[in-house]
């Protein structure tokens, strides 16, 4: 059964900036990846992110940069400074679709003890 | 404007073979997943085949598990489903129908469909 | 496999009343969930996708909404090309599923 995983960074160097790493471990062909926050995208959450392998990268504030790291995961910088800006115990969720199995999520947030700089 | 048109269906005798052709055109066929979906006289929607848009990746139910193959040719723009064995149980309607990555793969284009009757 | 129930299976309705249509699915879906019309002779339609989602061109009166497992359509005044078979579709997993479709017919 493909999986999903998911990292949540706090940058070391901006306190308030975080970077979201999420991968698909699994034999199909990655299709879309949609990264929200607050919950799964068809759970209440906000989409941060839309990430497709041919048609390219949509994100809305606060995202500043998503890319793809290899075919099958990607990441997520966020932007530290603002009213919509992410606090220490936000969920992050990351779905990818795949075809024809169809799609798998996971969601993390920033571990309470974590220091900055250290993966969750 | 997307059209897909449906060709290839007819009658046919329990045991026999058809091979039905769907033309793509006014959009990149290439970069679309791609799907078969027949309605059975007085039933329900069915989604009997699909295909990755690489060709890489297929999809069947069960019930044509081993009797149909799904294919394209992404240089002609054309999609194909190869049915052998056919049984009584297979006489529908057949579309060709075109799967949308951000719409989570709901179908956005169908063809008018081709007839497929299996009767001695 | 996910099997998606819809009800009821028919509806006698007037023109100009207000319609929902209900759709459950066997285990969640998340928001992987269209809803599709189709009339005799025609290929199906999309409407919505993504739940609520309005495909282009489909008029405002129709409109999606639901989470997880339970999903309805709702058309606000049924126009008289409004009557025909309407199926919910979830292409979450493998094996994508349709429901047995709700047909809408005059009264």
């Known amino acids: 059964t493909p999986e999903v995983w998911v990292q949540v960074r706090m940058e070391a160097t901006e306190l308030s900036s975080f970077t979201i790493r999420c991968g698909f471990l699994g034999s199909g062909s990655i299709s879309l990846v949609t990264v929200s926050w607050g919950g799964p995208n068809g759970a209440g959450g906000t989409t941060l992110a839309v990430l497709h392998p041919e048609r390219g990268i949509r994100q809305w504030a606060p995202a500043r940069q998503a890319r793809w790291e290899t075919q099958s995961s990607i990441s997520l910088i966020l932007e530290g400074s603002g009213a919509s800006s992410p606090c220490a115990n936000t969920t992050f969720c990351c779905k990818f679709a795949s075809f024809p199995e169809g799609s798998w999520e996971a969601c993390g947030s920033l571990p309470p003890s974590s220091d900055p700089g250290l993966s969750a | 404007e997307v059209q897909l048109v449906e060709s290839g269906g007819g009658l046919v005798q329990p045991g026999g073979s058809l091979r039905l052709s769907c033309a793509a055109s006014?959009?990149?066929?290439?970069?679309?997943?791609m799907s078969w979906v027949r309605q059975a006289p007085g039933k329900g929607l069915e989604l009997v085949a699909a295909?990755?848009?690489?060709?890489?990746?297929?999809y069947y139910p069960d019930t044509v598990k081993g009797r149909f193959t799904i294919s394209r040719d992404n240089a002609k723009n054309s999609l194909y489903l190869q049915m052998n064995s056919l049984r009584a149980e297979d006489t529908a309607v057949y579309y060709c129908?075109?799967?949308?990555?951000?719409?989570?793969?709901?179908?956005?284009?169908w063809g008018q469909g081709t007839l497929v009757t299996v009767s001695s | 496999e996910i099997v998606m129930t819809q009800s009821p299976p028919t509806l006698s309705l007037s023109p100009g009343e207000r319609v929902t249509l209900s759709c459950k699915a066997s285990?969640?879906?998340?928001?992987?969930v269209a809803w599709y019309q189709e009339k005799p002779g025609q290929a199906p339609r999309l409407l919505i996708y993504?739940?609520?989602h309005r495909f282009t061109g489909i008029p405002a009166r129709f409109s999606g909404s639901g989470s997880g497992t339970d999903f309805t359509l709702t058309i606000s005044s049924l126009q008289p090309e409004d009557f025909a078979v309407y199926y919910c579709h979830q292409a979450y997993r493998s094996p994508w599923t349709f429901g047995q479709g709700t047909k809408l017919e005059i009264k």
């Open positions: 295909i990755s848009r690489d060709g890489d990746s297929t």
């Open positions: 006014g959009f990149t066929f290439s970069s679309y997943h």
């Open positions: 129908s075109r799967h949308e990555d951000y719409f989570g793969f709901a179908m956005d284009s």
């Open positions: 285990q969640s879906v998340s928001n992987d």
């Open positions: 993504y739940v609520s």
